[in-house]
């Protein structure tokens, strides 16, 4: 029959060439002479000339060695024609299958692979996967079937079989317990890929396995006991730097220390913070310490990490004995600010109050007093007793020195310590009002017309406080009442001044006496300019000059 079974030809054949493969034969050759030919890629189209056919015998010829990795199968057509060129058979399919030889080594996809795994993981934990390829046939033969293995491990600690590689997938896994970053932070594996499923050609690559840090080491105080001296009253004072060692990866959360005061700080006097670079615990005073109350504190500080421990680890504790050093403390006025009521205008030498300070120090120190700031110079202070007396006229109405009835004085207490220290106190004198000011009109100069004059409204002011102010009374004296009239308007504390009789244009003195509710009288002379005009005027008009 005009049929050819698929032909298998091994690649890399040694010849001699041309090499006879198979014979094409048409049974029509009994009747006529047959000529054979082949067409298709590998015959008359690229790659041309790989195959040929003996025209008269029908022998299929191979002209050169084949390469399966280049072309694994050729599909040709066989033709049979009679002497006159007429086809005697339909074109026949010829399949030539190139069979594989193990002519390629495996090739890793990378020369160096990198991966990582946490320290302390259990055997069986996957680390990374490596891949090698082989161009040979891995389906019909083992030529391209790659088997992976670990050739060597560097270093060999704690032993030389810390990892395994899956023979067919290339997955590297941990096979032994004992991965400890603090002992071996990295392994270098020389890995092999061997074809023929492990029995053929071998190639190597490197797999670098970094061991990642886990918080499997607790920070430990070194030293564990500290002794410090701190002056009393110092706030924010560095008491001690506590040092820890931690074998975990520096500057990682597993290494960074967290400090906690766990005992001995009942008064919340101390605080501890982690130094960002050195990892030391910086113990400082949150509040001032008091030597007189407690001259020694024993603190207990615990250290952990920012990251939680991955296993149960003992917590390190440090003991810090803090000796409080006595400091000559300043005397303290009791109270720091003292309010005293005193009547203004009391005589010089009159006692105001006794204002004294206490010294916190244990030894009885002598305290002397003096006035530090007395803006008006109104007071004196006894250096021994702290007795404050009047040395000038206390004037509640003196706005240069008195604000809201209060005169403020600063006093000083100095002890006889070495060196001496000073404390200040504030004495606030609330000045009680005395009716020492009469009412005063405003303004004191007026301009008024002598015909149909407008009344002049003057405001009444009194520097004293109620009840030494309104209601006010007005009275004109020294014959001013002949031409003028004064009336108090109680509603708005004003006095209305009116011209009763005609006065020629000139300037006149109006003697106005005002008295307050406490009958404190004040005489004020009002300068009145009378103008030749009608009704309202601001300024006298210029005299009329005839033409």
């Amino acid at each position: 029959d005009w049929v050819v079974a698929p032909i298998s030809v091994p690649e890399n054949g040694k010849g001699p060439f041309p090499q006879r493969l198979n014979q094409l034969k048409s049974n029509k050759d009994r009747d006529t002479k047959i000529f054979y030919s082949i067409t298709g890629p590998g015959a008359d189209s690229p790659p041309e000339g790989v195959f040929a056919v003996e025209k008269e015998t029908g022998w299929l010829l191979l002209n050169k060695p084949l390469d399966r990795e280049e072309i694994a199968k050729y599909e040709l057509f066989g033709h049979a024609v009679s002497e006159n060129g007429a086809s005697v058979e339909d074109p026949m399919n010829i399949s030539i299958i190139v069979t594989d030889q193990n002519d390629h080594k495996p090739k890793f996809t990378q020369d160096t692979f990198r991966g990582s795994v946490l320290e302390g993981v259990l055997p069986g934990t996957s680390v990374m996967q490596v891949t090698a390829t082989d161009e040979d046939d891995a389906i019909h033969t083992y030529n391209g079937v790659v088997a992976y293995s670990i050739h060597s491990q560097e270093p060999k600690d704690p032993h030389d079989l810390m990892f395994t590689i899956h023979r067919s997938t290339g997955t590297i896994s941990v096979i032994s317990s004992g991965l400890d970053r603090e002992k071996v932070p990295e392994y270098t594996l020389t890995i092999q890929a061997t074809d023929m499923d492990g029995d053929g050609s071998t190639t190597t690559a490197v797999a670098v396995v970094e061991i990642l840090d886990a918080n499997d080491n607790a920070p430990v105080f070194d030293p564990q006991k500290y002794e410090s001296h701190v002056p009393e009253n110092a706030v924010g004072h560095e008491v001690q730097r506590l040092t820890v060692t931690d074998l975990d990866a520096p500057n990682s959360p597993a290494w960074r220390a967290t400090y906690l005061i766990v005992g001995g700080d009942d008064g919340d006097h101390f605080t501890i913070a982690t130094h960002p670079e050195s990892n030391q615990g910086i113990l400082t005073t949150r509040k001032g310490l008091d030597f007189e109350a407690k001259n020694q504190h024993t603190l207990y500080v615990e250290v952990t990490n920012e990251a939680p421990f991955v296993l149960k680890l003992p917590t390190s504790t440090a003991t810090i004995v803090v000796h409080v050093e006595d400091v000559n403390e300043a005397p303290v006025f009791v109270p720091p600010s003292k309010v005293v009521e005193v009547q203004e205008g009391i005589p010089t030498g009159e006692a105001v109050c006794v204002y004294t300070a206490k010294d916190p120090d244990k030894e009885n120190q002598k305290i002397s007093y003096r006035i530090l700031r007395d803006p008006a110079g109104w007071l004196a202070m006894d250096p021994d007793s702290g007795q404050v007396t009047v040395a000038g006229t206390l004037d509640r109405e003196d706005e240069r020195f008195v604000r809201n009835n209060i005169y403020e004085v600063m006093v000083l207490a100095v002890d006889n310590g070495s060196p001496p220290t000073t404390g200040t106190g504030t004495l606030l004198l609330t000045l009680i009002d005395v009716n020492d000011h009469g009412p005063v009109p405003e303004p004191r100069e007026i301009t008024i017309c002598n015909q149909s004059p407008e009344s002049q409204v003057l405001n009444i002011t009194d520097k004293d406080l109620s009840p030494h102010t309104s209601p006010f009374q007005a009275q004109l004296t020294d014959d001013s009442d002949i031409y003028w009239m004064a009336e108090v308007n109680e509603k708005d504390d004003t006095v209305v001044l009116s011209l009763k009789k005609f006065l020629k244009q000139d300037t006149y003195d109006v003697h106005l006496s005002l008295s307050d509710h406490g009958n404190k009288e004040q005489l004020t002379v009002i300068r009145a300019t009378v103008c030749d005009c009608h009704g309202h005027v601001e300024k006298c008009p210029d005299p009329w000059k005839g033409g």
Partner: antibody, heavy 123, light 113 residues
Framework: EVQLLESGGGLVQPGGSLRLSCAAS????????INWVRQAPGKGLEWLSV???????NYASSVKGRFTISRDNSKNTLYLQMNSLRAEDTAVYYC?????????????????WGQGTLVTVSS | DIVMTQSPDSLAVSLGERATINCKSS????????????LAWYQQKPGQPPKLLIY???TRESGVPDRFSGSGSGTDFTLTISSVQAEDVAVYYC?????????FGQGTKLEIK
């Protein structure tokens, strides 16, 4: 002071063998990977081989199977056994210390080099 | 193997001027896990062994003057000498240590104009 001193170079016929030595001092020899690098006359640098602290090795394909790197930590000495020498192996051979012990601390960078020893392969 | 290509092969620079040498790798030298580029720069003066200048692409080796700086990431790297001095005349090499075998660039010769 870190010092590396190569010796053992010289003239050898093609196909012959030679063993180079590198004496190290001034650092903890056993703690560092050490490399061999060569430089053909008037040419650039070519890395040949490394030996890690535990004795593991790696080679450039041009010398794999012909050259063998080894170390004797007790003598602070590195060796390069060169077999089947070819004319193209003619070069100055340097030993060079890795700056780090591990890949992650940069062991591929070489911070100290010897002065080199000249190997000439010629008939 | 990773191929390292330097440019230019040689350059002449006036004293005090800036010199720039480029280095290109056939594959990335950046390891994503630690964000480090596995590249070093060396200086080799005539008759002397090479001297390490830069590692991790940009970290200056101790004792190296600060006029030398390295930059770049992935496949493209640069060595810069900010103000060339007479003593900088040398051949400069880049080297990858991302993958075995370690490979060097062909070198760049720096001369003074």
């Amino acid at each position: 002071e870190v010092q590396l001193l190569e010796s053992g170079g010289g003239l050898v016929q093609p196909g012959g063998s030679l063993r180079l030595s590198c004496a190290a001092s001034g650092f903890s020899f056993s703690s560092y990977p050490i490399n061999w690098v060569r430089q053909a006359p008037g040419k650039g640098l070519e890395w040949l081989s490394v030996i890690w602290t535990g004795g593991g090795t790696n080679y450039a394909s041009s010398v794999k199977g012909r050259f063998t790197i080894s170390r004797d930590n007790s003598k602070n000495t590195l060796y390069l056994q060169m077999n089947s020498l070819r004319a193209e192996d003619t070069a100055v051979y340097y030993c060079a210390k890795s700056r780090g012990v591990y890949d992650f601390d940069g062991r591929g960078a070489m911070d100290y080099w010897g002065q080199g020893t000249l190997v000439t392969v010629s008939s | 193997d990773i191929v390292m290509t330097q440019s230019p092969d040689s350059l002449a620079v006036s004293l005090g001027e800036r010199a720039t040498i480029n280095c290109k790798s056939s594959q990335s030298l950046l390891y994503s896990s630690n964000q480090k580029n596995y590249l070093a720069w060396y200086q080799q003066k005539p008759g002397q062994p090479p001297k390490l200048l830069i590692y991790w692409a940009s970290t200056r080796e101790s004792g190296v003057p600060d006029r030398f700086s390295g930059s770049g990431s992935g496949t493209d790297f640069t060595l810069t000498i900010s103000s060339v001095q007479a003593e900088d005349v040398a051949v400069y090499y880049c080297q990858q240590y991302y993958s075995y075998p370690y490979t060097f660039g062909q070198g760049t010769k720096l001369e003074i104009k």
